[in-house]
């Protein structure tokens, strides 16, 4: 039985050109997490895996940094980086989380940036 | 008493293939990622290729990608890299290597690829 | 791609020295560092990993320390058989790279 659930940071927006960072939280539940997809529609930025670290996809490699934590930051934000972004937990024995995040990328410089949180 | 084994070195020509075998033993090894680490002849080591315990994830350094295939047999205990369109710069001693939590904890006593015409 | 730098390249010691070697990276790598021993015509062997955690068999004499980019290994008093090259190693992102070596020889 799956019993997690997945806390993100929800709807945030961002400026143009400016950076931000997607943070996801798995919480109760005691299953190890073997590893987190980064998924971008569907395209996938990066996997975390347990054993062997991070990999960033080739085609994000200038824009997508690890971390902190699970977390992704997304650098040098354009408008074509709004929408809707997806933390896959892939863990054992539960199965997989899915965690949502939408992406607001701003022109102007009023961007109301959302709510973060760092993983202990 | 964890062991691994590579085989299927040797000398090859500049184009040519080889098919590299890892056989393990005394360790969990369907639980396991593993990797090929390679040392040219007197020099120091570079990470090649690295897979995940169930083989559905595969990756790869810059200088071998499109060329290299890292595979594995969980049946078999076996791990294998197939090398294709070989260069002079891919000589070296090539091993294999168990990986847990980001490390390569075990490795084998390498096997050597020499391409040369 | 993160690189490493490991100095010195080579250093020469007498045993019971304390030695120490220096590993840095291009850029911020948690504490996903490694240290390997090999030995001429043998295959690298694991001592340290996490930057300081010492693998199970290892001499307690071996330590590690450092976080983000600098990291050192250091061997308290040297003994005959610590004669060999030292790699430090990242493991935070991939791909994984390797310092380029420190030769430990007797002096």
């Known amino acids: 039985m799956m019993t997690g659930t997945i806390e993100t940071t929800g709807n945030i927006s961002a400026e143009k050109g400016g950076s931000i960072i997607l943070q996801c939280h798995l919480s109760s539940t005691t299953a190890q997490v073997t590893q987190v997809n980064w998924e971008q529609q569907d395209q996938l930025l990066a996997i975390c895996n347990a054993d062997l670290g991070w990999h960033i996809s080739p085609s994000f490699k200038d824009r997508v940094a690890p971390g902190p934590g699970l977390g992704l930051t997304l650098q040098s934000l354009t408008v074509n980086d709004t929408g809707e972004y997806f933390c896959i937990y892939h863990t054992y024995p539960d199965g997989t989380y899915t965690g949502r995040i939408f992406l607001e990328v701003l022109e102007s410089s009023v961007a109301e940036h959302g709510a973060r949180f760092q993983i202990p | 008493e964890v062991q691994l084994l590579e085989s299927g070195g040797g000398l090859v020509q500049p184009g040519g293939s080889l098919r590299l075998s890892c056989a393990a033993s005394?360790?969990?090894?369907?639980?396991?990622?593993m990797g090929w680490v390679r040392q040219a002849p007197g020099k120091g080591l570079e990470w090649v290729s690295a897979?995940?315990?169930?083989?559905?994830?595969?990756y790869y350094a810059d200088s071998v990608k499109g060329r290299f295939t890292i595979s594995r047999d969980n049946s078999k205990n076996t791990l294998y890299l197939q090398m294709n369109s070989l260069r002079a710069e891919d000589t070296a001693v090539y091993y294999c290597?168990?990986?847990?939590?980001?490390?390569?904890?075990?490795w084998g006593q390498g096997t050597l690829v020499t391409v040369s015409s | 791609d993160i690189q490493m730098t490991q100095s010195p390249s080579s250093l020469s010691a007498s045993v019971g020295d304390r030695v120490t070697i220096t590993c840095r990276a291009s850029?911020?790598?948690?504490?996903?560092l490694n240290w390997y021993q090999q030995k001429p015509g043998k295959a690298p062997k694991l001592l340290i990993y996490?930057?300081?955690s010492l693998q199970s068999g290892v001499p307690s004499r071996f330590s590690g320390s450092g976080s983000g980019t600098d990291f050192t290994l250091t061997i308290s008093s040297l003994q005959p058989e610590d004669f060999a090259t030292y790699y430090c190693?990242?493991?935070?992102?991939?791909?994984?790279?390797f310092g380029g070596g420190t030769k430990v020889e007797i002096k």
């Open positions: 290597a168990s990986i847990r939590e980001r490390r390569f904890d075990f």
């Open positions: 005394g360790f969990a090894f369907s639980s396991y990622a």
């Open positions: 897979i995940t315990s169930s083989g559905g994830g595969t």
């Open positions: 850029q911020r790598i948690s504490t996903y």
């Open positions: 996490g930057t300081s």
């Open positions: 190693q990242q493991s935070y992102i991939i791909p994984w790279t």
